[in-house]
Interface confidence: low
Amino acid sequence: APVNGSKWTYFGPDGENSWSKKYPSCGGLLQSPIDLHSDILQYDASLTPLEFQGYNLSANKQFLLTNNGHSVKLNLPSDMHIQGLQSRYSATQLHLHWGNPNDPHGSEHTVSGQHFAAELHIVHYNSDLYPDASTASNKSEGLAVLAVLIEMGSFNPSYDKIFSHLQHVKYKGQEAFVPGFNIEELLPERTAEYYRYRGSLTTPPCNPTVLWTVFRNPVQISQEQLLALETALYCTHMDDPSPREMINNFRQVQKFDERLVYTSFSQVQVCTAAGLS
């Protein structure tokens, strides 16, 4: 919990350099996101593929989409869960991070110093040990987050199942309902290839309680979809006289104390015939 208040932003006096004043963990250990670069990577053969169970949400059910002033968040049911970690981790929500139209490089994690256009986080909590995400969030490895790196490319109909509702949640506190769809469609190809490390929430209170899985391969969304994400939302309430656009809602990469990042893949990319031409 913060020392006092709960006001934080990505820009200005309450921006990330000030987070640790109110949220001490933000200046502590195991902070995320990080830069994924060769010096800190180590192959771990025990990192087997994860199974995504209950991810195919019924189209007959509606799921709450919210503008929380920091991102756009979709609530997820707890029967949706990951199998393959040491405990069962049940889903609680997903949200995104992005840049702005003039600098569309807003992923939180970077690879060899390079940002992707945006990043999706699917947040899960250890439901074997804890009754809900809130309880789990300050317990060691209480949370597991799947991170999907997003690059600009071709139109992505699955992501549009969220983006098509952005106009209904333009302002902080606004809510809309999204019909269920297969959340697994939001994941990239070859989900067996991922980075794994122990880190934190990337937003206050920055609890160092997250088991991160960052998929190696990005997904693509179109320039138009990215632009919609970068321009549709505001951090402020509808009646706020000083509206603030929801842009650049990503945290800078953090110092990587003593840790290694484990990879489920050996780092040499296999050259295809096409790649050799």
Partner: antibody
């Protein structure tokens, strides 16, 4: 091979400062945190704090914050710990250690220890 | 701070014995438990990290186990050179904390 060589024993007056050096060799100094550990006579081990030689970021145990300063000299791959305003409570053997890589939060190599005696 | 408790402060055993030293944390430390050996002259060595991983150069007669709050170090076939004090240490949170130590002596 990895080695951490500490400076010799010191006898200091109460109220004086003491500075211990830890000269490292056999590995890349800036790639590993250096930790400092205290052991009072006949007692257990106490973690004082750690320093990242790459940028001198320190993390100190609250208990030692007011009188301990950790520094490094990258040119000589040497870490230093200074204890100010010494009292008899600071009489101890001090160890410098290297933090293991891999997120296991262990200390894989230790110096031989430096004995500090505070006495008038 | 997390308290680390080694209930047995000293232990006598015979050469060739199987010896187990235990350590308890005041809260779940998620297997971030390390064991060190301190020889009578003061030399300290890492034996085991992350509950059960043997540090390079450490004889295979040393092993570690445990989870949650309870951990143990086992020496399967005690040798003369194992006479030392053994400390556990948690790496889950700062400040790092150690157990009080268990002194192993020959009976």
């Amino acid at each position: 091979q990895v080695q951490l060589q500490q400076s010799g024993p010191q006898l200091v007056w109460p109220g004086a400062s003491v500075k211990i050096s830890c000269n490292t060799s056999g590995y890349s100094f800036t790639n590993y945190w250096i930790h400092w550990v205290k052991q009072r006579p006949g007692q257990g081990l106490e973690w004082i704090g750690m320093i990242d030689p790459s940028d001198s970021e320190t993390r100190l145990n609250q208990k030692f914050k007011d009188k301990t300063t950790l520094t490094v000299d990258r040119s000589s791959s040497t870490a230093y710990m200074q204890v100010s305003s010494s009292t008899s409570e600071d009489s101890a053997v001090y160890y410098c250690t290297r933090g293991i890589r891999g997120g296991y939060y262990a200390m894989d190599y230790w110096g031989q220890g430096t004995s500090v005696t505070v006495s008038s | 701070d997390i308290q680390m408790t080694q209930t047995t402060s000293s232990l006598s055993a015979s050469l060739g014995d199987r010896v187990t030293i235990s350590c308890r944390a005041s809260q779940d430390i998620s297997n971030y438990l390390n064991w060190y050996q301190q020889k009578p002259e003061g030399t300290v060595k890492l034996l085991i990290y992350y509950t059960s991983r043997l540090h390079s150069g450490v004889p295979s007669r040393f092993s570690g186990s445990g989870s949650g709050t309870d951990y143990s170090l086992t020496i399967s076939n005690l040798e003369q050179e194992d006479i030392a004090t053994y400390f556990c240490q948690q790496g889950d949170t700062l400040p790092r904390t150690f157990g009080e130590g268990t002194k192993l002596e020959i009976r």
